[in-house]
Interface confidence: low
């Protein structure tokens, strides 16, 4: 299968260090289906996203591992990420809801939008943030959000601030950002698409 494992890994790799720590702590107390054991605390707390994914799959298998991961993410308040994880593991059943553009089928990692897949790289590498803001202003960003991003002193912190608003965005909103990135830093998008 493999798809569920990849989706779990994508979700965990998109957590911040603090969120990953919180995820592990919640995993220690989340209710489990009958017949499943708990990952030992000592091993769990030292794991990175990759090790944790492998452990989740070996302990709970792919389907239940993905479901359990989504439950913990939801419990952490990361509803969109949980939804994306479940969408990725059940992909192929029906069309996208009206008004929300389906993810491109060529996407390397199903269920995650390009800008979510490459969050860290975009924070690190986007230089033309002002251009992005102008492209998104009034369509995706409110005046308050626009000003909040502009107020940040460095490009990475501007991008980090911009990403703090994306959990509320649908695919169309994220596509607008991707389109703006293609227009302002096409080489960067192409580089990330190849990676």
């Amino acid at each position: 299968m493999g798809r569920a494992r990849d989706a779990i890994l994508d979700a965990l790799e998109n957590l911040t260090a603090e969120e990953l720590k919180k995820f592990k702590l919640k995993l220690l107390s989340v209710p489990l289906r009958e017949g499943y054991g708990r990952i030992p605390r000592g091993a769990l707390l030292s794991m990175d996203a990759l090790d944790l994914t492998d452990k989740l799959v070996s302990f709970y298998l792919e389907t239940y591992g993905a479901e359990l991961t989504a439950n913990v993410l939801r419990d952490m308040g990361l509803q969109e990420m949980a939804g994306q994880l479940q969408a990725a593991t059940h992909q192929g059943s029906g069309a996208a809801p009206a008004g929300i553009q389906a993810p491109p089928q060529s996407a390397a990692k199903p269920g995650l939008h390009f800008i979510d897949q490459h969050r860290a790289a975009l924070i690190a590498r986007v230089t033309n943030v002002e251009w992005l803001l102008d492209a998104l202003y009034g369509k995706v960003l409110t005046d308050e959000q626009y000003q909040a991003v502009r107020a940040e002193p460095t490009n990475p912190s501007k991008m980090r601030k911009l990403f703090s608003f994306t959990p509320a965005w649908n695919w169309t909103c994220k596509d607008l950002l991707l389109q703006a990135l293609r227009e302002s830093q096409s080489y960067l998008v192409e580089d990330l698409e190849r990676s």
Epitope: T16, A17, E18, A120, A121, I123, A124, R125, V126, T127, A148, A151, E152, P153, T154, N155, P156, S157, R160, K161, S164, L188, D191
Partner: antibody, heavy 120, light 112 residues
Framework: QVQLKESGPGLVAPSQSLSITCTVS????????VHWVRQPPGKGLEWLGV???????NYNSALMSRLSISKDNSKSQVFLKMNSLQTADTAMYYC??????????????WGQGTSVTVSS | DVVMTQTPLSLPVSLGDQASISCRSS???????????LHWYLQKPGQSPKLLIY???NRFSGVPDRFSGSGSGTDFTLKISRVEAEDLGVYFC?????????FGGGTKLEIK
């Protein structure tokens, strides 16, 4: 493994300029920022500036007029240039990697430093 | 610029003792994104600084669990539960919430 190594002239005459190169290995400059920090003999650390992964820069405002940071991603090198040096610029100069990839958002690896003495 | 004030300047300890270093900033280090970018570094004699704690309380990889960071807003503390000989050196706090990034003056941990 991650390594940063500074190379500089050692001795610089007053009013002359300083050029230091930071050569990195074990990571890509397209994914990580590099900061410059200096430490006068027996004193504390002073942040000079940073070049982010995308190439944009930020400087310590007190030094901005005579400081410039650039890089060559393909050669894995970051360059610090400072003009009009005075004896107060005598210090150990360090480059340090800035990690956002793992969400540390701190200077997680430092070079061993290069000593710069400003003297005639 | 944000001024970082560390106390004490020098901290004589006996091996096995607990050590505590305080760091105070001239303005809040809580970023608008909710994170607090306060870090601790250790510089051993003749070496470059090494990252110990990032974002207030997170131990960097390979850092022993006897090191812990705490605090919020403008007041932060680094604690070493049982000082070992390899812990001796100068400890610096640093903030990266506001540009320019700034460091504390350092606290020298030495044997009593």
């Amino acid at each position: 493994q991650v390594q940063l190594k500074e190379s500089g002239p050692g001795l610089v005459a007053p009013s002359q300029s300083l050029s230091i190169t930071c050569t990195v290995s074990g990571f890509s400059l397209t994914s990580y920022g590099v900061h410059w920090v200096r430490q006068p003999p027996g004193k504390g650390l002073e942040w000079l500036g940073v070049i982010w992964a995308g190439g944009s820069t930020n400087y310590n405002s007190a030094l901005m007029s005579r400081l410039s940071i650039s890089k060559d991603n393909s050669k894995s090198q970051v360059f610090l240039k400072m003009n009009s040096l005075q004896t107060a610029d005598t210090a150990m100069y360090y480059c340090a990697r800035w990690d956002y990839v793992n969400s540390y958002e701190a200077m997680d690896y430092w070079g061993q430093g290069t000593s710069v003495t400003v003297s005639s | 610029d944000v001024v970082m004030t560390q106390t004490p300047l020098s901290l004589p300890v006996s091996l096995g003792d607990q050590a505590s270093i305080s760091c105070r900033s001239s303005q809040s280090l809580v970023h608008s994104n909710g994170n607090t970018y306060l870090h601790w570094y250790l510089q051993k004699p003749g070496q470059s600084p090494k990252l110990l704690i990032y974002k207030v309380s997170n131990r960097f990889s390979g850092v022993p669990d006897r090191f812990s960071g705490s605090g919020s807003g403008t007041d932060f503390t680094l604690k070493i539960s049982r000082v070992e000989a390899e812990d001796l050196g100068v400890y610096f706090c640093s903030q990266s919430t506001h540009v320019p990034y700034t460091f504390g003056g350092g606290t020298k941990l030495e044997i009593k």
